[in-house]
Interface confidence: low
């Protein structure tokens, strides 16, 4: 007859460090004292005829435990196979790229520490919920990497590694370990640079918009733009309309800016850059200035009148320029009469680049002369009716300007001129009209003869 | 195209250290293994460890544990291989490998760095 | 470890004629994952190993196709259709399942 020797439980399945308590069993009448043969740590816990319990402690890896005993002479053994699970240590999803180009692949890499048994364990790779990769768990540390080709969605997706040790055949579940999740963050970035509209030329101390707008930019909220005039940085108002992103500020031209620069628009996003450059000129175009030596000038002085402007600028004083680009337009006169009020026009030239540029400058003399009145406004003998409505059309001229009375000789009487008046046989005499100012008097005699209305 | 390239021929003395460069080139270091295989005169090959550069994990042949260290410098795209206490039966050529993954073949080898171990 | 031994020691061919290598592993070579990580290297005389076959039967590229590979578990074999002048070396049996990774004791192919 053949006797068995039983071992339970039969290969059990236990988390690691954990203790199993183990159970020999004969049915051989004439038995010896059972052994248990294995390298793990064990305790006889209690015997009899027969049988023998045994408690193993710290069972921290797969191992087969072996039950012997002689059984009339002869060895008769049994074993079990004990299958230890635990899971991973470490699920650690490696750092993502800081930016990701959209359209081009970036690696998911895993390393998974611990976990066993192996063959039980299967590591996942996710965005949001959504697996990407389902490998099983090779070698320690197991590393697993997934490409993926990253989208505009991905902008802001958590990717995340998950273990899964599949105990559900030993009837213990599933057991799921999960990284903590890394956020990617992807970009388009165009390879066409920005459009930069600034103006040509720029006048020192004079302020102009500066516009610099970049399109097909994602996310466009998250872009930098540096925006200068050489090397003084331009404050720029960025806004943003969908992928198009526009920078707009106002350049102003230092006179230690003058000359040829460089206004730059910079975007940078993802860590990578794009670059629109124009060039400007920076000018400083001072005058024209026109100058009198006498801003007021008596009769029969001498006046000078110059006109200037900075250097490279050509001036033209009323038709007559200057010897050369950066020098002064003279010209000199004898003030007459007829000078008073005069205009001195100064016209100034700048060359920018092949561009010219114009400026216009005037002034006004002023002629001090004495009072006169114009004798052919001023009829010396008037013939008019009476009871009829007249005008006596004197004018006076000179600077200071004079004022004028027509007085009549041997009375006070005056008559208004330049204004309507009823004339009378009394306005019948002889006038002095009297141009008086602080520059003295002119007189002239005029005489009026009324003609007396006739009843029938 | 894809090479290692290692670092010239070595003579030491019994107790000495060593250390063997191989630089990658042609490929992205960090994606790849890296991997150590000794052959001495006249013999088979023996493989003595492993590196991942990019996470600067290593695993070691039970034989050499302790005696060798591989490290990885992934700005230079390089990785190195220090053997210490060397003894006679060091004397060997030490090959650098790589393999795309695990647990896959080595498809590519440096050209090899002769350490001779002699007193 | 896995222990691999290959056989013949030494293969004495003429050129054109086939050859073929054997390997046996001391343990089963099949992964957990269903792959079989078994590969054929090449050492020319002077130079390092280079890569023949990997996965039993995957030829790596620019291998000619007079070269194969099959097995499985335990047993694998590496042949020749047309051994050429440019064939002759040692060649090595290596596996990657378990660690440490191991290689066969090599098979020189010489010219008879």
């Known amino acids: 007859q053949e006797f068995l020797l039983r071992v339970e439980p039969q290969n059990p399945v236990l988390s690691a460090g954990g203790s199993l308590f183990v159970n020999c069993s004969t049915d051989c009448p004439s038995s010896e004292k059972i052994a248990l043969e294995t390298s793990l740590s064990k305790e006889l816990v209690a015997s009899g005829m027969g049988w023998a319990a045994f408690n193993l402690s710290n069972v921290t890896g797969n191992s087969r435990i072996l039950c012997s005993v002689y059984c009339n002479g002869s060895q008769i053994t049994g074993s079990s196979n004990i299958t230890v699970y635990g899971l991973p240590e470490r699920v650690e999803l490696a750092p993502l790229p800081p930016w990701q180009p959209v359209g081009q692949n970036f690696t998911l890499r895993c390393q998974v520490e611990g976990g066993s048994p192996r063959t039980s364990l299967t590591v996942v790779l996710l965005r949001w919920e959504e697996e990407l990769s389902r490998q099983p768990a090779v070698e320690e540390p197991a590393e697993v990497t997934a490409t993926v080709l990253a989208s505009r969605d991905d902008h802001g997706a958590p990717f995340s590694c998950r273990t899964e040790l599949d105990m559900q055949p030993q009837g213990l579940g599933l057991f799921v370990n999960t990284s903590a999740p890394r956020q990617l963050r992807t970009f388009v970035l165009p390879v066409t640079p920005p459009r930069l509209v600034a103006p040509r030329f720029l006048e020192v101390e004079t302020s102009w918009p500066v516009d610099c707008t970049l399109d097909g930019l994602f996310p466009a909220s998250e872009a930098q733009v540096y925006l200068a005039l050489g090397d003084q940085m331009l404050n720029a108002t960025v806004m943003n309309h969908g992928d198009t992103l526009t920078a707009t500020a106002t350049a102003t031209a230092r006179a230690d800016q003058e000359g040829a620069r460089e206004i730059v628009c910079n975007v940078t996003l993802g860590g990578e850059r794009r670059e629109a450059r124009e060039n400007l000129t920076v000018f400083s175009f001072l005058g024209p200035i026109v100058n009198l030596s006498e801003p007021t000038a008596h009769e029969g002085s001498t006046v000078t009148v110059s006109c200037m402007a900075g250097a490279r600028v050509q001036v033209t004083l009323d038709g007559v320029p200057a010897a050369a680009p950066g020098q002064t337009a003279q010209l000199q006169l004898n003030a007459t009469e007829s000078d008073d009020g005069r205009s001195f026009f100064c016209s100034a030239t700048l060359e920018v680049d092949g561009e010219f540029l114009h400026r216009n400058s005037s002034v006004q003399l002023r002629v001090l002369y004495g009072p006169k009145i114009d004798r052919a406004t001023c009829p010396q003998h008037l013939k008019w009716k009476d009871k009829t409505r007249h005008v006596l059309q004197c004018q006076a001229r000179g600077n200071p300007y004079p004022e004028l009375r027509c007085l009549k000789e041997g009375s006070s009487r005056e008559v208004p001129v330049g204004i309507p008046f009823f004339v009378n046989v009394t306005h019948n005499g002889t006038y002095q009209c009297q141009a008086s100012s602080s520059r003295g008097k002119y007189t002239l005699v005029v005489v009026m003869d009324i003609e007396a209305f006739s009843s029938h | 195209q894809i090479q290692l390239v290692q670092s010239g021929a070595e003579v030491k003395k019994p107790g000495a250290s060593v250390k063997v460069s191989c630089k990658a080139s042609g490929y992205t270091f960090t994606d790849c293994i890296i991997l150590w295989v000794r052959q001495a005169p006249g013999q088979g090959l023996e493989w003595m460890g492993k590196i991942n550069p990019y996470f600067g994990t290593t695993t070691y042949a039970q034989k050499f544990q302790g005696r060798v260290t591989i490290t990885a410098d992934t700005s230079t795209s390089t990785a190195y291989m220090e053997l210490s206490s060397l003894r006679s039966e060091d004397t060997a050529v030490y090959y650098c490998?790589?393999?795309?993954?695990?647990?896959?073949?080595?498809?590519?080898w440096g050209q090899g760095t002769l350490v001779t171990v002699s007193s | 470890d896995a222990v691999m031994t290959q056989t013949p020691l030494s293969l004495p061919v003429s050129l054109g004629d086939q050859a073929s290598i054997s390997c046996r592993s001391s343990?089963?070579?099949?992964?957990?994952?269903?792959?079989?990580?078994l590969h054929w290297y090449l050492q020319k005389p002077g130079q390092s190993p280079q890569l023949l076959i990997y996965?039993?039967?995957n030829r790596f590229s620019g291998v000619p196709d007079r070269f194969s590979g099959s097995g499985s578990g335990t047993d694998f074999t590496l042949k020749l259709s047309r051994v050429e002048a440019e064939d002759l070396g040692v060649y090595f049996c290596?596996?990657?399942?378990?660690?440490?990774?191991?290689f066969g004791g090599g098979t020189k192919l010489e010219i008879k």
């Open positions: 343990q089963s070579l099949v992964h957990s994952n269903g792959d079989t990580y």
């Open positions: 290596s596996q990657s399942t378990h660690v440490p990774y191991t």
């Open positions: 490998a790589r393999k795309e993954a695990y647990p896959d073949a080595m498809d590519y």
């Open positions: 996965k039993v039967s």
